[in-house]
Amino acid sequence: SAHAHPRDSCPLGPGRCCHLETVQATLEDLGWSDWVLSPRQLQLSMCVGECPHLYRSANTHAQIKARLHGLQPDKVPAPCCVPSSYTPVVLMHRTDSGVSLQTYDDLVARGCHCA
Amino acid sequence: SAHAHPRDSCPLGPGRCCHLETVQATLEDLGWSDWVLSPRQLQLSMCVGECPHLYRSANTHAQIKARLHGLQPDKVPAPCCVPSSYTPVVLMHRTDSGVSLQTYDDLVARGCHCA
């Protein structure tokens, strides 16, 4: 069916398909060291890996995209691994009056799917 | 700033960066000919093209991903071009009792961004 459940076993082998991975990054890496005080080192969850046919399809569009990619690979790209949801984080910001807590709702991925 | 506006001019040349493109597909292409009656031919808008540094960044995560891809290209993938919104479509479905109208909210892309 067009609304088949997303496939969750990776046909390419362990760790090859779309998944969440932790990447260490410093404020300097991000170019944020001028206004973010802390933490200086961030554990950023990101979505990495391939999206083989119907693996973790985000929605109907992604399923169709996967199918058309099989038929017209030069014209239609394969789905790719992107965040499905985010975990909000709070960082300490430098302000004119001292330090404040700053919310980032869309900085750290919480889950991934193929879109 | 971490919340810089997404860049909208493509540094790779016309038509190379993430954009919406119409793809023709038949119900047979989609594997839907058993239960969708009409239309037999669909014009599906899909997101195609590359995501150079900070081009149409979906959010803070995508900006960070672009930056870290520049620093660690083997570990962090570049952002990729995916739908930012969808246009609902109505298809005619075959049912046990005849024909019904079925809405698909997430079949046709309406806009694209780099995530």
Partner: antibody, heavy 120, light 107 residues
Framework: QVQLVQSGAEVKKPGATVKVSCKAS????????IHWVRQAPGQGLEWMGW????????VYAQKLQGRVTMTTDTSTSTAYMELRSLRSDDTAVYYC?????????????WGQGTLVTVSS | DIQMTQSPSSVSASVGDRVTITCRAS??????LAWYQQKPGKAPKLLIY???SLQSGVPSRFSGSGSGTDFTLTISSLQPEDFATYYC?????????FGGGTKVEIK
């Protein structure tokens, strides 16, 4: 693994000053801030303030402003909390806690705690 | 300051029970809530941050939910090692503030 080891218990007279230390290991000390929290006997948790080891920036709870000073020594990966003009209601277990790796305003891991008793 | 109110202040339960603790903030804090477990004579331990994200190494029987002003910590099947006091803490603005605690006791 990440560890915070605090100095031993102290008994102080009212009006005195106490300085509690918190030695960090298992991570890059100046990458994360340190929070200080206290807990009076049989009571709940009270946040005292925060310091970033990297720049020395601090935020103190309003009710302790003027009596508390938080410092760090990056050469020894140690954070310090000094509380002056001690009163009997300052009797508590004092904890240091690192910012969590995920978010600055969540606390973990924690030190084992230092009991400070203020008594004449 | 943002006040955090926990309820109940204590709960008696048996091993295997489902236990729910609630925490209410005096003003909206989005998802900026953490939950801690403290055993007698020990330091608190972070269980959940950002309302529902499980801290690494914490068993999956612990879960958190909520946003805005109302939050919940659920222990799906109470284990002997879960008898402790649980605190919520808001991380939306300074000063950081804690709830009064909920003691989970053996029935």
């Amino acid at each position: 693994q990440v560890q915070l080891v605090q100095s031993g218990a102290e008994v102080k007279k009212p009006g005195a000053t106490v300085k509690v230390s918190c030695k960090a290991s298992g991570y890059t000390f100046d990458s994360y801030g340190i929070h200080w929290v206290r807990q009076a006997p049989g009571q709940g948790l009270e946040w005292m303030g925060w310091i970033t080891a990297y720049s020395g920036d601090t935020v103190y709870a309003q009710k302790l402003q003027g009596r508390v000073t938080m410092t760090t020594d990056t050469s020894t990966s140690t954070a310090y909390m000094e509380l002056r003009s001690l009163r009997s209601d300052d009797t508590a277990v004092y904890y240091c806690a690192r910012e969590s790796g995920q978010t600055s305003s969540a606390l973990g891991p924690w030190g084992q705690g230092t009991l400070v008793t203020v008594s004449s | 300051d943002i006040q955090m109110t926990q309820s109940p202040s204590s709960v008696s339960a048996s091993v295997g029970d489902r236990v729910t603790i609630t925490c209410r903030a005096s003003q909206g804090i989005s998802r900026w809530l953490a939950w801690y477990q403290q055993k007698p004579g020990k330091a608190p331990k972070l269980l959940i941050y950002a309302a529902s994200s499980l801290q690494s190494g914490v068993p999956s029987r612990f879960s958190g939910s909520g946003s805005g002003t109302d939050f919940t910590l659920t222990i799906s099947s109470l284990q002997p090692e879960d008898f402790a006091t649980y605190y919520c803490q808001q991380g939306a603005s300074f000063p950081l503030t804690f709830g009064g605690g909920t003691k989970v006791e053996i029935k």
